[in-house]
């Protein structure tokens, strides 16, 4: 075999295979449950119909120091196109109910898989 | 007052490498998403991709993820766009810009023209 | 990958009210795709009007709103004055990248 330059670099993620990812992400998380996750944390909860992925970063950003949901924010935060930080509350218009963090995994999973179910992966 | 400076007019050859500079100033580039966009001579605007500064993640849209890399400089404040295997469809006036919630896409570098020509 | 479509050109009076459209090829357009509105003028740089829908940009003229109607993104130019006339593009995020639209130039007359 020839190596023929350098590694190319990998494809842009399509849309449904970015959607596919973080809802197996999600499944992992629920499905590796064991303690209560993240401490028992809770986060404001959304509305899934309104600018869900931004929302749904700006909540989880704020907790810290929970190893099992790492990823899942680093996958929100390319599926938002400004750039999020703890404490800001842009897309997150409501603010007047807090979940557990499992909760508001599970809500978000059941969404993201209707989404998908549908076809909707914009 | 926020201000993105972009680097001067290229006039390149097919084949070859062109870095654009963009240099802030008014704000900490760490804090906003970098997003650069094309326009061709007379045509509408192609998004390019995006840049974190803050740690170099980056979007790509995907033609043209396999030649063009972005990245940032946090200690002068300046964000690049590099573009390779440049050809004559190339040839177009690239931005840089700053998006947020607040200020989608609210500012623009001046824009650089890059003339691709044998 | 997703087309955005919009009409070529449009017309208003001056003080009219003209609304502009954003189509995407892949359904319905929703607030998941922060819709954007963007400004451009003959040899000049582009300035972002609307983003996230109907957030509208800094310094940019109340007369600008932006909505979703039926299932398009839509930039109402209420009141229209001589200096709106210009092109103006829409861009849709798609999940991990923008696809922004075709244009549409507004003429003022």
């Known amino acids: 075999l020839t190596c023929l330059g350098g590694f190319a670099s990998p494809g842009p993620v399509p849309p449904s295979t970015a959607l596919r990812e973080l809802i197996e992400e999600l499944v992992n998380i629920t499905q590796n449950q064991k303690a209560p996750l993240c401490n028992g944390s809770m986060v404001w909860s959304i509305n899934l119909t309104a600018g869900m992925y931004c929302a749904a970063l700006e909540s989880l950003i704020n907790v810290s120091g929970c190893s099992a949901i790492e990823k899942t924010q680093r996958m929100l935060s390319g599926f938002c196109p400004h750039k999020v930080s703890a404490g800001q509350f842009s897309s997150l218009h409501v603010r007047d109910t807090k979940i557990e963090v499992a909760q508001f995994v599970k809500d978000l999973l059941l969404h993201l898989k209707k989404l998908f179910r549908e076809g909707q992966f914009n | 007052e926020v201000q993105l400076v972009q680097s001067g007019a290229e006039v390149l050859k097919p084949g070859a490498t062109v870095l654009i500079s963009c240099k802030v100033s008014?704000?900490?580039?760490?804090?906003?998403?970098m997003h650069w966009v094309q326009q061709a001579p007379g045509k509408g605007l192609e998004w390019m991709g995006r840049?974190?500064?803050?740690?170099?993640?980056?979007k790509y849209a995907p033609k043209f993820h396999d030649r063009v890399t972005l990245t940032a400089d946090t200690s002068t404040d300046t964000a690049y766009m590099e573009l390779s295997s440049l050809r004559s469809e190339d040839t177009a006036v690239y931005y840089c810009?700053?998006?947020?919630?607040?200020?989608?896409?609210?500012?623009w570098g001046q824009g650089t023209l890059v003339t691709v020509s044998s | 990958q997703a087309v955005v479509t919009q009409e070529p050109s449009l017309t208003v009076s001056p003080g009219g009210t003209v609304t502009l459209t954003c189509r995407s090829s892949?359904?319905?357009?929703?607030?998941?795709?922060?819709a954007n509105w963007v400004q451009q003028k003959p040899g000049q740089a582009p300035r972002g009007l609307i983003g996230?829908?109907?957030n509208r940009a800094p310094g940019v003229p109340a007369r600008f709103s932006g909505s979703l109607l039926g299932d398009k993104a839509a930039l109402t130019l209420s009141g229209a004055q001589p200096e709106d006339e210009a092109e103006y593009y829409c861009?849709?995020?798609?999940?991990?990248?923008?696809?922004f639209g075709t244009g549409t130039k507004v003429t003022v007359l």
């Open positions: 810009t700053r998006y947020d919630y607040y200020g989608p896409f609210a500012y």
């Open positions: 008014g704000y900490t580039i760490t804090d906003y998403y």
């Open positions: 840049i974190d500064p803050e740690d170099g993640e980056t």
């Open positions: 892949t359904g319905a357009v929703t607030t998941s795709n922060y």
């Open positions: 996230g829908t109907n």
């Open positions: 861009a849709l995020w798609y999940i991990n990248h923008f696809i």
